[in-house]
């Protein structure tokens, strides 16, 4: 169920601190605006207060979307979805956020990458990703190329390849040329998830051809 309240919350950390400590979908408000957005809040993992900005779990949602769709978000917050680059950009430019990326493979293993500093540039700068301070179990080297790249979609090619990474690998992502990750790639079912050049990739955990079973990207203020 949607959990609405008269209070205005910028992120799930504010929701958590207001006393709402149950996982679920909450209404968040854009910083310095009255515009609202629905987001899934993880109130249990690692102390709670996490705003889920991406989830892949079953292939039910098409992630080969346009620039505008990645800008405003798509999918279902209770399942597979992308929260929206514009909201995340505005949010992460207000204060310091951490980004946690949780990954599952098809063999029952889980891993994570935690970045102590995360923000997205404005749309004018193509929602370039900025990351620092990597820790975690999903590789000592960042699978999101650093320094960060501009976001690219099938209709917005900002990568560093003469090819068009988003069209070739599918999905919108911070492609390099084309780089060691793409968590918005084509969902591949079990036993069809190896040797996939266009799958859900996190190179420094599972290598280049392995397509993951599930991914979650979540953010939280660093001072939570």
């Amino acid at each position: 169920d949607y959990k609405d309240d008269d209070d205005k919350f910028r992120d799930c950390a504010e929701v958590f601190k207001s006393g709402h400590t149950t996982n679920g979908i909450y209404t968040l408000t854009f910083p310095n605006s009255t515009e609202e957005i629905k987001a899934y809040c993880d109130m249990e993992a690692g102390g709670g207060g996490w705003t889920i900005i991406q989830r892949r779990e079953d292939g039910s949602v098409d992630f080969q979307r346009t620039w505008k769709e990645y800008k405003v978000g798509f999918g279902n917050p209770s399942g597979e979805y992308w929260l929206g680059n514009e909201f995340v950009s505005q949010l992460t430019n207000q204060q310091r956020y951490v980004l946690k990326i949780h990954l599952k493979d098809w063999e029952g293993n889980e891993a994570y990458s935690l970045y102590e500093h995360f923000y997205l540039s404005s749309e004018e700068l193509n929602y370039r990703i900025h990351l620092k301070g990597l820790t975690g179990t999903a590789g000592k080297i960042s699978s999101i190329s650093q320094p960060g790249n501009d976001f690219s979609t099938k209709d917005g090619d900002n990568d560093k390849c003469i090819c068009k990474c988003s069209q070739m690998l599918t999905g919108g992502w911070w492609f390099d040329a084309c780089g060691p990750s793409n968590l918005n790639g084509m969902y591949a079912p079990q036993r069809q998830n190896t040797n996939k050049f266009n799958g859900i990739k996190w190179y420094y955990w599972k290598g280049s051809g392995y397509s993951l079973k599930a991914t979650t990207m979540m953010i939280r203020p660093a001072d939570f």
Epitope: R96, R128, K132, L134, K140, P147
Partner: antibody, heavy 121, light 107 residues
Framework: DVQLQESGPGLVKPSQSLSLTCTVT?????????WNWIRQFPGNKLEWMGY???????SYNPSLKSRISITRDTSKNQFFLQLNSVTPEDTATYYC??????????????WGQGTSVTVSS | SIVMTQTPKLLLVSAGDRVTITCKAS??????VAWYQQKPGQSPKLLIY???NRYTGVPDRFTGSGYGTDFTFAISTVQAEDLAIYFC?????????FGGGTKLEIK
């Protein structure tokens, strides 16, 4: 291409304030990244002094925190260093530089050519 | 603050030699280490970032490696124009700190 240019007096008297300007061309200082001041002492030791981010937030080296201020003039695409109560130990070449991350310290990819400042009476 | 101890202070080499400079951090700097080259009369120039990534336009004879506390910078085949001072810098924690520099002199 991004260019940074420092300017300011080459000689400052002890106990006075040192004021320097960094003029940036080829990139808006409000768009992204952090804009730093670094100094190099005689003998080549480098010290990061602080930055002002594209959003206007500042971060300073704790060793200078009581004496330093970094501000900006967005209309002129300039940022400034003010260092108060200088002593001869503040004699150095002062550089402005852009770092590759906007909300925290990072490596610096564009540097000015530096301006030499001597503190002496 | 993280202290970056850089060795050696001076390297006297011939053109064509391979040289290695090391930096040891007083505590973990993850892979948030950069290397700079400063030629006489010039400002520092970024060569390597995130310990091992070559900055745009930097020749591939310059390489970096390391993680945690131990970092290495190498020039595979020294050329005359590599005469400079080389600095490491950590930016894992604030304030960012630099090594003391290694002066490379050509015989």
């Amino acid at each position: 291409d991004v260019q940074l240019q420092e300017s300011g007096p080459g000689l400052v008297k002890p106990s006075q304030s040192l004021s320097l300007t960094c003029t940036v061309t080829g990139y808006s200082i409000t768009s992204d990244y952090a804009w730093n001041w670094i100094r190099q002492f005689p003998g080549n030791k480098l010290e990061w002094m602080g930055y002002i981010s594209y959003s206007g937030s500042t971060s300073y080296n704790p060793s200078l925190k009581s004496r330093i201020s970094i501000t900006r003039d967005t209309s002129k695409n300039q940022f400034f260093l003010q260092l108060n109560s200088v002593t001869p130990e503040d004699t150095a070449t002062y550089y402005c530089a852009r770092s590759t991350f906007g909300h925290y310290v990072s490596s610096m990819d564009y540097w000015g050519q530096g301006t030499s400042v001597t503190v002496s009476s | 603050s993280i202290v970056m101890t850089q060795t050696p202070k001076l390297l006297l080499v011939s053109a064509g030699d391979r040289v290695t400079i090391t930096c040891k951090a007083s505590q973990s700097a993850s892979n948030d280490v950069a290397w700079y080259q400063q030629k006489p009369g010039q400002s520092p120039k970024l060569l390597i970032y995130y310990a091992s990534n070559r900055y745009t336009g930097v020749p591939d004879r310059f390489t970096g490696s390391g993680y945690g506390t131990d970092f290495t910078f190498a020039i595979s085949t020294v050329q005359a124009e590599d005469l400079a001072i080389y600095f490491c810098q950590q930016d894992y924690s604030s304030p960012p700190t630099f090594g003391g520099g290694t002066k490379l002199e050509i015989k």
